[in-house]
């Protein structure tokens, strides 16, 4: 069985301020089981953008229907983009653990740049 891969197909995405940004991510397998999360930045200071398991993320919507039992698409859309949202976004698969899930594999990242709002 091939090991799960996290695919972020776009290296970069450019969005005008005020618009929505779609960040694409797909898994190649449902196994190992565990949630996915999106982060801005890497390392200890990374910012959680979306957690499949829990939390309220009012600006984030999932592109696909995550309640489908065979879903492998974990793309997200972030609304009302501002310059402060610029950065590199990582889609990260976690392996279930008790008490804490363990990071399993990260996508290569997608750099979001924000253009000035057209006048």
């Amino acid at each position: 069985e091939d090991e799960l891969q996290v695919i972020q197909p776009e290296k970069s995405v450019s969005v005008a301020a005020g618009e929505s940004a779609t960040l694409r991510c797909a898994m190649t397998s449902l196994i190992p089981v565990g949630p996915i999360m999106w982060f801005r930045g890497a390392g200890a200071g990374r910012e959680l953008i979306y957690n499949q398991k829990e939390g309220h993320f009012p600006r984030v919507t999932t592109v696909s229907e995550l309640t489908k039992r065979n879903n492998l698409d974990f793309s997200i859309s972030i609304s009302n983009i501002t310059p402060a949202d610029a950065g590199t976004y990582y889609c990260v698969k976690f392996r279930k653990g008790s008490p804490d899930d363990v990071e399993f594999k990260s996508g290569a990242g997608t750099e979001l740049s924000v253009r000035a709002k057209p006048s």
Partner: antibody
Framework: DVQLVESGGAVVRPGETLRLSCTAS????????MSWVRQAPGKGLEWVSG????????YYADSVKGRSTISRDNSKNTLYLRMSSLTAEDTAVYYC???????????WGLGTLVTVSS | ALTQPASVSANPGETVKITCSGG?????YGWYQQKSPGSAPVTLI????KRPSDIPSRFSGSASGSTATLTITGVQVEDEAVYYC???????????FGAGTTLTVL
């Protein structure tokens, strides 16, 4: 508070068809997958069927596949289970349950009793 | 199918552990309490170890490999019930339950 209220249970004859309903309140129904779980008299819990939040994808246990249809009307906050060709083995209390992100269950209804008897 | 003991017993205040095995590493587990046949089950634990906010803290869950464990620390008389483990398998898209464990508080 999350509330799930089943209805439609009845005494029916073998071979007949029945539709169960589950009305949900206290949460955004259209955001959650839902399932039906049943319990035959003196037996344990048995998962019957599940449906994705939009209703586009459905899933069935082998015991009901081909003669049951799960559906939902998100505008009415209602989940349905239509069962045909009923047999005595379908006699059970039928519960609707809300699914968690990983397809387990966090809330259950009180159940509705289906009795198949000639 | 998931395997759990048919019955366990304990004195008030003791700690009870109920195990559930057979789901494999591609499963998540939940624990459901049913106080009488035909009454609504109550979710004690989902996602191996997540306890809903309205469930007393004496109930806890854990999982290691393909075995899940429900622990009741300081069991009380009102905990007499049947406890079902349930699993979801990502390889089959199917939910399964154990046959139930009857807890008797002596």
């Amino acid at each position: 508070d999350v509330q799930l209220v089943e209805s439609g249970g009845a005494v029916v004859r073998p071979g007949e068809t029945l539709r169960l309903s589950c009305t949900a309140s206290g949460f955004t129904f259209s955001s959650y997958a839902m399932s039906w779980v049943r319990q035959a008299p003196g037996k344990g819990l048995e998962w019957v069927s599940g449906i994705s939040a939009s209703g586009s994808d459905t899933y069935y246990a082998d015991s009901v596949k081909g003669r049951s249809t799960i559906s939902r009307d998100n505008s009415k906050n209602t989940l349905y289970l239509r069962m045909s060709s009923l047999t005595a083995e379908d006699t059970a209390v039928y519960y609707c349950a809300r699914e968690t992100w990983n397809h387990l269950f966090d809330y259950w209804g009180l159940g509705t009793l289906v009795t198949v008897s000639s | 199918a998931l395997t759990q003991p048919a019955s366990v017993s304990a004195n008030p205040g003791e700690t009870v552990k109920i195990t559930c095995s057979g789901g494999g590493t591609s499963s998540y587990y939940g624990w459901y309490q049913q106080k009488s046949p035909g009454s609504a089950p109550v979710t004690l634990i989902h996602s191996d170890d997540k306890r809903p906010s309205d469930i007393p803290s004496r109930f806890s869950g854990s999982a290691s490999g393909s075995t899940a464990t429900l622990t009741i620390t300081g069991v009380q008389v009102e905990d007499e019930a049947v406890y079902y483990c349930g699993g979801y398998d990502y390889t089959t898209y199917v939910n399964t339950f154990g046959a139930g464990t009857t807890l008797t508080v002596l």
